[in-house]
């Protein structure tokens, strides 16, 4: 027979030879990191047809790392289903808890013993320090010193000293989230007031108001014979300016050869007339109020 078979889990006892006589026996032992559990044979014999009798390394089992329990408020998950060396043990914490330590341990072989690569981690409750205080505003639960996971606070603005109210810019409600950080930055309370939007040769068709504060939205259309240059809809943004800027109504060219510029808001049409029925509370054309505003 030629050289006997090789295995992942067991190795030949003694030096291998290039050839073996019929009837000659070779013995195997479990490799380092493996241990033998009977009754499977760990030897083979050179048969008279010059082949080795069947043998396997299934009696050699990998050394195993000690069992690790789930951490309190968490879970230990074996990546490949056993505690044998080479195994990975993944740790996750329950919602509302965070991991202190390594989230993966490896079952490693030290000499002939399988041991874990480190200490199992802990799962600690997620806690947040109080959220930021803000100028001209306050948040709920201002007396609380420690917040737990998903605890929420709501910000509100103080009454303004002048005629215009403070607007809350940002998220009014934030919560204690992962990494012990708040879900959003604290909002800001400030007076946001946009100028009255004047459109020559046009008119406002929605969003009428005494004053235009944060997020106020206004829509326009142009008089007959004029087209909208810009957006028909503008919003009062946190820097007290309209975005996009207040549009202009430009005269439609009367020359038959010249193409009128088109509104960026309304596509290739010389005038932009949104259907008035889209704007609740705005009079319908048949009420005779919208006609001839110029």
């Amino acid at each position: 027979c030629e050289a006997p078979p090789t295995f992942e889990a067991m190795e030949l006892i003694g030096k291998p030879k290039p050839y073996y006589r019929v009837g000659e026996r070779v013995d195997y032992k479990c490799k380092k990191g493996y241990f033998y559990i009977p009754p499977l044979a760990t030897h083979t014999i050179c048969d008279r047809n010059h082949t080795w009798l069947p043998v396997s390394d299934e009696g050699c089992y990998r050394e195993m790392c000690p069992h690790i329990r789930d951490p309190l408020n968490g879970e230990a998950i074996l990546a490949n289903g056993s505690y044998e060396f080479g195994a990975e043990l993944h740790f996750i914490c329950n919602e509302g808890y965070y991991l202190i330590g390594k989230d993966i341990l490896y079952c490693e072989l030290k000499d002939t013993v399988a041991i874990w690569s480190g200490k199992p981690p802990l799962c600690e409750k997620i806690l947040c320090t109080p959220p930021p205080k803000i100028k001209n505003g306050k948040h709920t639960f201002s007396e609380v010193e420690v917040f737990e996971y998903l605890d929420a606070v709501t910000y509100s603005c103080d009454p303004a000293p002048g005629p215009d109210p403070f607007s809350l810019i940002g998220e009014s409600m934030i919560y204690c989230g992962n990494n012990s950080t708040w879900s959003h930055a604290a909002p800001e309370c400030k007076v946001v007031k946009c100028r009255f939007p004047v459109v020559e040769n046009g008119k406002q068709i929605s969003g009428f108001g005494k004053k235009f504060y944060y997020k106020a939205t206004v829509m326009f259309e142009c008089d007959k014979g004029y087209y909208l240059n810009g957006s028909d809809k503008i919003v009062c943004e946190s820097n007290s300016t309209w975005d996009p800027p207040v549009p202009k109504c430009l005269k439609v060219s009367t020359s038959p050869t010249t193409k009128s510029p088109t509104s960026s808001a309304s596509g290739p049409r010389p005038t932009y007339k949104p259907p008035v029925s889209n704007y609740p509370g705005y009079p319908k054309p048949d009420e005779g109020i919208l006609n001839n505003l110029d």
Epitope: K193, R195, F208, I289, L290, N292, L293
Partner: antibody, heavy 118, light 107 residues
């Protein structure tokens, strides 16, 4: 609080020109939107136009060809240039600070009288 | 341009009377209407903006109402110092225009 004072009024012949001034004290004229309004017994109150803080202007189209509003920040003064004056332009002319960007007029000066007569 | 028509053109009231002045717009103007009072020998002064908001320092006997095309200025108990000419003004559309005025006298 800014004070606006009109000047430059007087007697002018029909067809003539006149430039009215609106001087700001206690504040910068460029920080406010300034409107010109006139008042006469025959025509009542008439809004003539406005110059915005960004230097843009809007006019009453009835006067657009003859009246021009401008501003000289170095002199802290707004102006109303009136050309081709007619007898019906006889009126008291007010420069008026637009209220905080909104078209209501809360800061009237004493006005300056312009008389167009031959 | 949008025309504003005030009525009556003049009225005479006794001190303590309730006075009502109306302003009608030739087109729909939402609530974009202001009221002014010009006392004898003085420049106009703002009383009410955006139909019903009292300007600072204006006594609360003045009130405004209305919407669309019809607007009203009321003086609940007129006083001697309320004499003068009252004007309405629209600002929904350029040119901004004024009513012709209503003269209020005290009997």
């Amino acid at each position: 609080e800014v004070q606006l004072v009109e000047s430059g009024g007087g007697l002018v012949q029909p067809g003539g020109s006149l430039r009215l001034s609106c001087a700001a004290s206690g504040g910068s004229v460029s920080s406010y939107d300034i409107s010109w309004i006139r008042q006469s017994p025959s025509r009542g109150l008439e809004w003539l136009g406005v110059i915005w803080t960004d230097g843009g202007t809007n006019y009453n189209s009835a006067f657009m060809s003859r009246f021009t509003i401008s501003r000289d920040d170095s002199k802290n003064t707004a102006y109303l240039q009136m050309n081709s004056l007619k007898t019906e332009d006889t009126a008291v002319y007010y420069c008026e600070r637009v209220y905080d960007g909104y078209p209501w007029f809360a800061y009237w000066g004493q006005g300056t009288l312009v008389t167009v007569s031959s | 341009a949008i025309q504003l028509t005030q009525s009556p053109s003049s009225l005479s009231a006794s001190v303590g009377d309730r006075v009502t002045i109306t302003c009608r717009a030739s087109q729909w103007i939402s609530n974009y209407l202001n009221w002014y009072l010009q006392k004898p020998g003085q420049s106009p002064q703002l009383l009410i903006y955006y139909t019903s908001s009292l300007h600072s320092g204006v006594p609360d006997r003045f009130s405004g109402s209305g919407s669309g095309t019809d607007f009203t200025l009321k003086i609940s108990r007129v006083e001697a110092e309320d004499v003068g000419v009252y004007y309405c003004q629209q600002y929904i559309k350029l040119p901004w225009t004024f009513g012709q005025g209503t003269k209020v006298e005290i009997k």
